[in-house]
Amino acid sequence: LQDLCSNCPAGTFCDNNRSQICSPCPPNSFSSAGGQRTCDICRQCKGVFKTRKECSSTSNAECDCISGYHCLGAECSMCEQDCKQGQELTKKGCKDCCFGTFNDQKRGICRPWTNCSLDGKSVLVNGTKERDVVCGPSPADLSPGASSATPPAPAREPGHSPQ
């Protein structure tokens, strides 16, 4: 008997009430694999969810979040409110990133600016609430400084001696 059911393709179910004939999934249901004894109910994308992909007899519907929200969890199981760049979502709503932190997305938390000096770099562009600092070469990466030089040349011009 099991062999009969295993012949039922995706999009059908093995109908015990009808001598294990393969019956098509009813409307608003699907089976994504063969040999199923029942079809699963299609997911409905309602409220803050919107349909990204319609349900078919062989695959479940896929949901997205409506504008102003973003997906969380596997297969977009939840929608969370967007904030602006430079903010993070707290229990009290969207709050600006504290000084020294940034968030360049509409979701997630504010993260600390990179500490360039830890890598022996210098700050090329300061950080903002929306952007991390940009680290660049330190002065010592660009030239060896006065250590590379012969003794500085003596002053040669009245009123214009090197400082």
Partner: antibody, heavy 111, light 112 residues
Framework: QVQLKESGPGLVAPSQSLSITCTVS????????ISWIRQPPGKGLEWLGV???????NYNSTFMSRLSINKDNSKSQVFLKMNSLQTDDTAIYYC?????WGQGTSVTVSS | DVVMTQTPLSLPVSLGDQASISCRSS???????????LHWFLQKPGQSPKLLIY???NRFPGVPDRFSGSGSGTDFTLKISRVEAEDLGVYFC?????????FGGGTKLEIK
């Protein structure tokens, strides 16, 4: 953010002197050395000299007798003075932090 | 003075090709502090030079990863893995190890 801007006379008569001021922003002259580099029309780059963070200077020996570089850290300004200009000193003069260059100031030596 | 010899003088390429520019110095560019102050710049027409690579192989922030630098001692190379239109211009190598700082004569990257 880091910026260097040269301001010069544009036209200099032969045998006269050239003075260019470089005003920097976004960093301190006590942290970075500043060089002067020039580029004659259609030619390569020529290093003139450097003023180190501590105020000491080094010059390209080719220009040593007629070049002076100074700075004012508090005003974020570096000064180039070159004497006895000739027509072959016609060039774009750049104020340079190595990783950032000014836009250059064009100097033409002509009577 | 340290002489920097750049080859080739002109480099015709097709877009998408790899390009390679060589720079040789007349003496070692290894400073007593262990660093090698060999930098690469790109100058586009009417613009000031822009730093691409510092200390032989370090890409300056914002420089695409198709640019890479290599070498040691007196022999250095700049490679562009897939040339794009915006890469055209004159490339200079520069040494800041020894005073006076000196530059290569430049390599003009142009469309074949």
């Amino acid at each position: 953010q880091v910026q260097l801007k040269e301001s010069g006379p544009g036209l200099v008569a032969p045998s006269q002197s050239l003075s260019i001021t470089c005003t920097v922003s976004g960093f301190s002259l006590t942290t970075y050395d500043i060089s002067w580099i020039r580029q004659p029309p259609g030619k390569g780059l020529e290093w003139l000299g450097v003023i180190w963070t501590g105020g000491g200077t080094n010059y390209n020996s080719t220009f040593m007798s007629r070049l002076s570089i100074n700075k004012d850290n508090s005003k974020s300004q570096v000064f180039l003075k070159m004497n006895s200009l000739q027509t072959d000193d016609t060039a774009i003069y750049y104020c340079v932090r190595v990783d950032y260059w000014g836009q250059g100031t064009s100097v033409t030596v002509s009577s | 003075d340290v002489v920097m010899t750049q080859t080739p003088l002109s480099l015709p390429v097709s877009l998408g090709d790899q390009a390679s520019i060589s720079c040789r110095s007349s003496q070692s560019l290894v400073h007593s502090n262990g660093n090698t102050y060999l930098h690469w710049f790109l100058q586009k027409p009417g613009q000031s030079p822009k730093l691409l690579i510092y200390k032989v192989s370090n890409r300056f922030p914002g420089v695409p990863d198709r640019f890479s630098g290599s070498g040691s001692g007196t022999d250095f190379t700049l490679k562009i893995s897939r040339v794009e239109a915006e890469d055209l211009g004159v490339y200079f190598c520069s040494q800041n190890t020894h005073v006076p700082w000196t530059f290569g004569g430049g390599t003009k990257l142009e469309i074949k």
